[in-house]
């Protein structure tokens, strides 16, 4: 019954948050 991330309705927003965090991390490392 435990879902994969892609099946979860939260996945879309979670991926967006993850991408934004990655971008912030990149900028911080520059």
């Amino acid at each position: 019954c435990i879902h994969h991330l892609d099946e979860s309705p939260h996945s879309q927003a979670l991926k967006k948050v993850f991408a934004e965090n990655k971008e912030i991390q990149k900028l911080a490392e520059q």
Epitope: C1, I2, H3, E7, P9, H10, S11, Q12, A13, K16
Partner: antibody, heavy 117, light 112 residues
Framework: QIQLVQSGPELKKPGETVKISCKAS????????MNWVKQAPGKGLKWMGW????????TYTEEFKGRFAFSLATSASTAYLQINNLRNEDTATYFC??????????WGQGTSVTVSS | DVVMTQTPLSLPVSLGDQASISCRSS???????????LHWFLQKPGQSPKLLIY???NRFSGVPDRFSGSGSGTDFTLKISRVEAEDLGVYFC?????????FGAGTKLELK
């Protein structure tokens, strides 16, 4: 402010088709998934599935595979629920709801669908 | 599917009382990412459900602090410290850790 505004009540005959709209405003439509929930008269809430507003990919629960279809008009920030070949047991109020990383935070006001011959 | 069992189904209160609603899940709601996706909604007659508490204990924007959520694993509680007239309605717990998302049957908070 964030709002989900659904289309008005529908009275249909068995075998007909209905298409419900859910217009989003106050946020970036393609950043959040959209849930659809059914509530039969005097009953609880039943999750029908969701649509990814970025990719357009719908996900349906077992009960709602076949006659039900989620779709989008992304340019109009609108999600749709279509029910084909309506049955009496489809009589219910249908809600759309925005899905964040944490929860289902904002819901539409609901659209009442009555199926009667 | 995860079954959400709410108790009681009806809760008669007087204004100013404390109210407590229980929600038990048929399996753990701890997601592999560590989050617990257990939420509480209030639905008033003729309206859509409104989010009160998300992820067990987080109050949603604009929700008064008389509402609090607690719990872990499979056992969760919503407490209203002092019931006001605007709090009357049907409370639903919901889980979104597992697909399909599921809801409790609802608890009707009503006046004695």
């Amino acid at each position: 402010q964030i709002q989900l505004v659904q289309s008005g009540p529908e009275l249909k005959k068995p075998g007909e088709t209905v298409k419900i709209s859910c217009k989003a405003s106050g946020y970036t439509f393609t950043n959040y998934g959209m849930n659809w929930v059914k509530q039969a008269p005097g009953k609880g809430l039943k999750w029908m599935g969701w649509i990814n507003t970025d990719t357009g990919k719908p996900t349906y629960t077992e009960e709602f595979k076949g006659r039900f279809a989620f779709s989008l008009a992304t340019s109009a920030s609108t999600a749709y629920l279509q029910i084909n070949n309506l049955r009496n047991e489809d009589t219910a109020t249908y809600f759309c709801g925005r899905v964040t990383a944490d929860s289902m935070d904002y819901w539409g006001q609901g659209t009442s669908v009555t199926v009667s011959s | 599917d995860v079954v959400m069992t709410q108790t009681p189904l009806s809760l008669p209160v007087s204004l100013g009382d404390q109210a407590s609603i229980s929600c038990r899940s048929s399996q753990s709601l701890v997601h592999s990412n560590g989050n617990i996706y257990l939420h509480w909604f209030l639905q008033k007659p003729g309206q859509s459900p409104k989010l009160l508490i998300y992820k067990v204990s987080n109050r949603f924007s604009g929700v008064p602090d008389r509402f609090s959520g607690s719990g872990s694993g499979t056992d969760f509680t919503l407490k209203i410290s002092r019931v006001e007239a605007e709090d009357l309605g049907v409370y639903f717990c919901s889980q979104s850790t597992h697909v399909p998302l599921t809801f409790g049957a609802g608890t009707k908070l009503e006046l004695k």
